[in-house]
Interface confidence: low
């Protein structure tokens, strides 16, 4: 006959308050003859949880029919779990004896602990925007979980990040815990469309981690590059000057033209386009009247982007005598 083994497969069982906990116990042999009892704790002070033969255990039910002779499953369910139920539970085989049964073998025990799922992670970015090549911090918080063991990972566009610090509080025993992690992310110029993800894995989530996300578009400012060019063609007495504002984010932009230091209100036309990486281009056209101008006209395109200090680009207008004398037809 095979030697009796008491199998309690779960080392740890997580339960929530008010729910029912199932404590598994199976045996590998029907011998020796005698009952299986459940205890919490060990030693002389252990607490009897279930005895099929005697006693009243209103919160305990058996999973199988223990009255059947060939039953080898002594698993029990304990209903309406409270914090007072935590501890290590042992199923113990007794051998028929006289005048009383004798303890024969104990299972390895199942620790029952209160479990609670973490809240959905909340990711917060920096309060102010930062330009590429700089480092920004993101924080991730999740609360209310138990037990304390938890895994948190950071990703940027699917790539795992390594520069982060994580704390789980409190450090001592508690009914529930919180996690806070701060990740440092170096911004790239193309990060307008990027995301950071905080992923939390916990035993209560059954292998399906929780995720919180933040868009780097909220944290990045890509400053524009400016280029002012004079078009080779003119219309009558006017020369077309273009100011190209490239690769900026966010969209907030003020553009001002000035002529020899005097701000001009007239802007012929402008277009806004979005690049594949999420940044924007802005093109502004300005017509300069050259019929009675001297040769030393200086045009300035000034751009104020997202409340930052203005940047500008100047162009000294090239108006040849030949251009001044031409007719009002458009010419190359």
């Amino acid at each position: 006959e095979e030697e009796l083994q008491m199998i309690q497969p779960e080392k740890l069982l997580l339960v929530t308050v008010g729910k029912t906990a199932t404590l598994h116990c199976t045996v590998t042999s029907l011998l020796p003859v005698g009952p299986v009892l459940w205890f919490r704790g060990v030693g002389p002070g252990r607490e009897l949880i279930y005895n099929q033969k005697e006693g009243h255990f209103p919160r305990v039910t058996t999973v199988s029919d223990l009255t059947k002779r060939n039953n080898m499953d002594f698993s029990i369910r304990i209903s309406s779990i409270t914090p007072a139920d935590v501890g290590t539970y042992y199923c113990v085989k007794f051998r028929k004896g006289s005048p009383e049964d004798v303890e024969f073998k104990s299972g390895p025990g199942t620790e029952m602990a209160l479990g609670a799922k973490p809240s959905a992670p909340v990711v917060l970015g920096p309060a102010a925007r930062t330009t590429p090549e700089h480092t920004v911090s993101f924080t991730c918080e999740s609360h209310g979980f138990s037990p304390r063991d938890i895994t948190l990972k950071w990703f940027k566009n699917g790539n795992e990040l390594s520069d982060f610090q994580t704390n789980v509080d409190p450090t001592g025993q508690s009914v529930a815990y919180s996690i806070r992690s701060t990740a440092r992310v170096v911004l790239d110029p193309w990060d307008v469309r990027s995301q950071v993800i905080c992923e939390v894995a916990h035993v209560t989530l059954q292998g399906d981690p929780l995720r919180g996300t933040a868009n780097l578009s909220e944290a990045i400012r890509v400053p524009p590059t400016l280029e002012v060019t004079q078009q080779p063609m003119r219309v009558g007495n006017q020369v077309n000057v273009t100011c190209q504002v490239r690769k900026f984010y966010p969209q907030s932009l003020q553009l001002t033209w000035s002529e020899n230091g005097n701000v001009c209100q007239r802007e012929t036309a402008s277009t806004l386009t979005e690049n594949k990486d999420g940044t924007y281009n802005w093109t502004s056209w300005f017509l300069v009247n050259i019929s009675d101008q001297r040769d030393d006209v200086v045009l300035t395109c000034q751009v104020k982007h997202d409340g930052q200090l203005a940047v500008s680009k100047r162009l000294a207008l090239e108006v040849t005598v030949h251009q001044k004398d031409q007719s009002s037809d458009a010419t190359p």
């Epitope: 008010g18 729910k19 199932t22 999973v63 698993s75 209903s79 292998g207």
Partner: antibody, heavy 118, light 107 residues
């Protein structure tokens, strides 16, 4: 991706036998109770069997003694051996995972059709 | 065995409606009640477990409530994809048992 894929269904004569398989992927198979549920065409769902992580097994009276459930954790596989089949066993058979939090059936396979007919 | 009785058996509603399906157990099931959605030719999909907990990935328009023996599934604002058959199931006691189903149809 968490996935369950059933196979082994087909046409069998009354009194015959059939063995259904369920291949699990994307999770730690050995940590979960597993279940079989069936659905006769145009009718409702009926629980057929459960196997616990300790190997404990459960059946309703309608199949007890005729069906056996087993698992092979090393192969991430669940099985349902159906003997002495009757016309009333004709149904789509689904395997389902019992969530280790509270044994709710959280993930289901696509099902495999079993037809018992002469 | 625990009997699970769903009502109504069928229900006609319009897009945007709020609908409620009820499920009654023949004895106390300790809130171990699940709700499933099934579309023709497809496997059931888990919506709710332990009477009121939303399964991961299920939209919040689905909600479950109740305790003891009486439970409800509510869909707050029906969308075309919500027209399906809904089942309740108790998993407190073997044998696990399902309700007979509620077919939700477009009015």
């Amino acid at each position: 991706e968490v996935q369950l894929v059933e196979s082994g269904g087909g046409l069998v004569q009354p009194g015959g036998s059939l063995r259904l398989s369920c291949a699990a992927s994307g999770f730690t198979f050995s940590s979960f109770d597993m279940h079989w549920v069936r659905q006769p065409t145009g009718k409702g769902l009926e629980w057929v069997s459960t196997i616990g992580i300790a190997g404990d097994t459960y059946f309703p009276g309608s199949v007890k003694g005729r069906f056996t459930i087993s698992r092979e954790n090393a192969k991430n596989s669940l099985y349902l051996q159906m003997n002495s089949l009757r016309a009333g066993d004709t149904a789509v058979y689904y395997c389902a995972r019992g969530g280790n939090w509270d044994d709710a059936l959280d993930i289901w396979g696509q099902g495999t059709m079993v037809t018992v007919s002469s | 065995d625990i009997q699970m009785t769903q009502s109504p058996s069928s229900l006609s509603a319009s897009v945007g409606d709020r609908v409620t399906i009820t499920c009654r157990a023949s004895q106390d099931i300790n809130n171990y009640l699940a709700w499933f959605q099934q579309k023709p030719g497809k496997a059931p999909k888990s919506l709710i477990y332990t009477a009121s907990s939303l399964q991961s990935g299920v939209p919040s328009k689905f909600s479950g409530s109740g305790s003891g023996t009486d439970f409800t599934l509510t869909i707050s604002s029906l969308q075309p994809e919500d027209f399906a058959t809904y089942y309740c199931q108790q998993y407190n006691t073997y044998p696990y048992t399902f309700g007979q189903g509620t077919k939700l149809e477009i009015k």
